[in-house]
Interface confidence: medium
């Protein structure tokens, strides 16, 4: 899941950070505690994040995140989720990891 280098990327990352920050700070249990595959974000980027979150349905709280990730993932065809073997985590924990990854990317590039 390479990250597209474009003028709008920093703005999109900032939008994602804001959305993820909203989610992580809201104290309501996210997606009723649903579990997702833990993925290697450093290796797969936003595409694997999107793949992992695609398995969550009927959760309005992450729709906007999914939409932003869709825009950040610039591959043509779906790939298999690069998961850490048999590791599932709560979607809230996943979102926290995604937020850390996105902040790191926003601070240090590449774009």
């Amino acid at each position: 899941g390479p990250v597209p280098r474009s003028v709008s990327l920093p703005l999109t990352l900032k939008e994602l950070i804001e959305e993820l920050s909203n989610i992580t700070q809201d104290q309501t249990p996210l997606c009723n505690g649903s579990m997702v595959w833990s993925v290697d974000l450093a290796a797969g980027g936003f595409c694997v994040a999107l793949d992992s979150l695609t398995n969550i349905s009927n959760c309005n709280a992450i729709y906007r995140t999914q939409r932003i990730l869709h825009g950040l993932c610039n591959r043509k065809a779906p790939t298999t989720v690069s998961s850490l073997p048999d590791t599932k985590i709560e979607v809230a924990h996943f979102i926290t990891k995604l937020l850390s990854y996105t902040k790191q990317l926003f601070r240090h590039g590449p774009f």
């Epitope: 920050s21 909203n22 992580t24 700070q25 104290q27 249990p29 924990h93 926290t96 850390s100």
Partner: antibody, heavy 123, light 110 residues
Amino acid sequence: QIQLVQSGPELKKPGESVKISCKASGYTFTDYAMHWVKQAPGKGLKWMAWINTYTGKPTYADDFKGRFVFSLEASASTATLQISNLKNEDTATYFCARAGRTEGTHYYAMDAWGQGTSVTVSS
Amino acid sequence: DIVLTQSPVLAVSLGQRATISCRASQSVSISSSDLMHWYQQRPGHQPKLLIYRTSNLVSGIPARFSGSGSGTDFTLTIDPVQADDIAAYYCQQGRESPWTFGGGTKLELK
């Protein structure tokens, strides 16, 4: 270490306003939501509101809509509570408390508290 | 709103076991957890988180504190009770907003 330090006690007359501050240190302020909790003398704890420290957006309990304003001075890592048109029943100790889902915290629980600010409303 | 009910007072002897209960008006469970937390408040002090998500002991809290329960019925156990455990204990649900606390149980010496 994580610290939440609140402003000092206040003695006010009915109809006046009060502003209470809660200064955070020892962690990244904008990574954690901040809650406010009221405790009337000899009574239990009552949740008032939480504020998103990244966006500044507060979410209120029904009983605390109207005269209560929850805000931030994020650059100073400070959350504030302002109560206008004070009433006798506002006499209480007000606590700020940190909470959030960030890794390393206790999911959904208030894991660090300020020392409390006593507000007395009396004519 | 989820209402949490606690007994107002529990009298206990030093060295004995104290069992403090909290009953919720509806389930505080999600698929993977029961979202009930326990706080201690000594007189004149701020509350302190003891146990989160029903049974997880906060780092630095003595092992004589433990939590159990599921659904709507929860328990905080202190065994054995020591003198500095004399305080009020509050349960709090994290299942839905508005977040609510129990009325508190004051631990007193017999």
